[in-house]
Amino acid sequence: KCQTPLGMASGHIRDFQITASGQYGQWAPKLARLHYSGSINAWSTKEPFSWIKVDLLAPMIIHGIKTQGARQKFSSLYISQFIIMYSLDGKKWQTYRGNSTGTLMVFFGNVDSSGIKHNIFNPPIIARYIHLHPTHYSIRSTLRMELMGCDLNSCSMPLGMESKAISDAQITASSYFTNMFATWSPSKARLHLQGRSNAWRPQVNNPKEWLQVDFQKTMKVTGVTTQGVKSLLTSMYVKEFLISSSQDGHQWTLFFQNGKVKVFQGNQDSFTPVVNSLDPPLLTRYLRIHPQSWVHQIALRMEVLGCEAQDLY
């Protein structure tokens, strides 16, 4: 179960979370994402004792790592062997040794520039920070990677808005805005979506509008991440919203906290994702977001956090 990509490829792990000892030219740490494409499409360094670090922002269970090299013109660049270090606080570091208490474990990495090598951590690592240290490489230490695992409490993983595991058909709304050559449909309400009309916008701006996600089965929802959007000059975002839930899509219950309807504090700009936790969590099939106040226009990109309800038993 705990084999979810943690977000290197999808971008759920943001650029600022990825740092390194150094870089070769423009081959920056933020490019170290599995399947990344382009002429400069990986982290690379010439330094002999280099490292790349990922800050997962919270402790996670890490079950494995997928690695990939890259090409530069006619050269294959990759890391053939590496060691892993990890930390909960960023200060006290441990070297991964597998089941042994003695020698550190050297992982065998890639043999070419494009193949993906999946190394399993058995036992899994529990850490916030992961350090990868190349020990052998071809030409330069060069890396694209994905971390595989799950949240420590196993229930605040992205449920699929950004990754599209939640399909377009599962996202509906009270209405949506269309203009010449632009459609701000419900399926555009995906965290970090790019493009011309890259958010949901309702036909009219009023507090009766809503965006709905159908998970198609009962899920435990522990939080929502919201984001606004910016056109060339105009920032649009939702400042406050309500949440309602339903098991059948007909009878809806607003989310209460301390005996009253909870008004969630949303975004303060058009680009920064804001996470709101649901305490207590919701067990629901359907979830609705009801914007209550906004800047310029209602515009929403979002992710839902949680896990499958059956994972709890």
Partner: antibody, heavy 117, light 108 residues
Framework: QVQLVQSGAEVKKPGASVKVSCKVS????????VHWVGQAPGKGLEWVGS????????IYAREFQGSVTMTADTSTDIAYMELSSLRSDDTAVYYC??????????WGQGTMVTVSS | EIALTQSPGTLSLSPGERATLSCRAS???????LAWYQQKPGQAPRLLIY???TRATGIPDRFSGSGSGTDFTLTISRLEPEDFAVYYC?????????FGQGTRLEIK
């Protein structure tokens, strides 16, 4: 800074054609559609048509269908509006404009097209 | 195609007064698609209001828009000398775009 800079004034004879350009800066042309609006001397605003540089799709006002063609060169970030079979009543200032986010928020400075024999 | 009729054609008022400009559509449409522009001589139009009531970036709050269906209004609460200009309403959206014929706001 987002700007639309249009080509200079033109004087044309009836029956001729004119091609007005609109150079965008501060963003990439394919990000937004380009709308064209005409204004005859002392008159109101009249929508000519709209062009989507991303898809190449255009929508023209009924009055201009058959006489207007909108194109773009995405490598130089320039949109074009060509009017053919010019008549004296095509004499107007022509503006390009882009929506941000919906209505026409950003405008070019206008290009005066004079049709006179 | 929806036609927009603006009234009055000319409005004569003094600075400090309240201006109310009307825009009537030949058939009902969503207020999401109604905009107001200001144009001064020799200048390109300037967007004031879109979505019938949302002020464009940088527009002073003395400008406000309202209305729905077929009747829309632009209100300038206290006229400043720089507000005297021609005002146009516009219906935009997924197909044909239309402008009203304009209201000239002049100093009395």
């Amino acid at each position: 800074q987002v700007q639309l800079v249009q080509s200079g004034a033109e004087v044309k004879k009836p029956g001729a054609s004119v091609k007005v350009s609109c150079k965008v800066s501060g963003y990439t042309l394919t990000e937004l559609p380009v709308h064209w609006v005409g204004q005859a001397p002392g008159k109101g605003l009249e929508w000519v048509g709209s062009f989507d540089p991303e898809s190449g799709e255009s929508i023209y006002a009924r009055e201009f269908q058959g006489s207007v063609t909108m194109t773009a060169d995405t490598s130089t970030d320039i949109a074009y509006m060509e009017l053919s079979s010019l008549r004296s009543d095509d004499t107007a200032v022509y503006y390009c404009a882009v929506p941000d986010p919906d209505a026409f928020d950003i405008w070019g400075q206008g290009t005066m097209v004079t049709v006179s024999s | 195609e929806i036609a927009l009729t603006q009234s009055p054609g000319t409005l004569s008022l003094s600075p400090g007064e309240r201006a109310t400009l009307s825009c009537r559509a030949s058939q009902s449409f969503s207020s999401s698609y109604l905009a107001w522009y200001q144009q001064k001589p020799g200048q390109a139009p300037r967007l004031l209001i879109y979505g019938a009531s949302t002020r464009a970036t940088g527009i002073p709050d003395r400008f406000s828009g309202s209305g729905s269906g077929t009747d829309f209004t632009l209100t300038i609460s206290r006229l400043e000398p720089e507000d005297f200009a021609v005002y146009y309403c516009q219906k935009y959206g997924t197909s044909a775009i239309t402008f009203g014929q304009g209201t000239r706001l002049e100093i009395k």
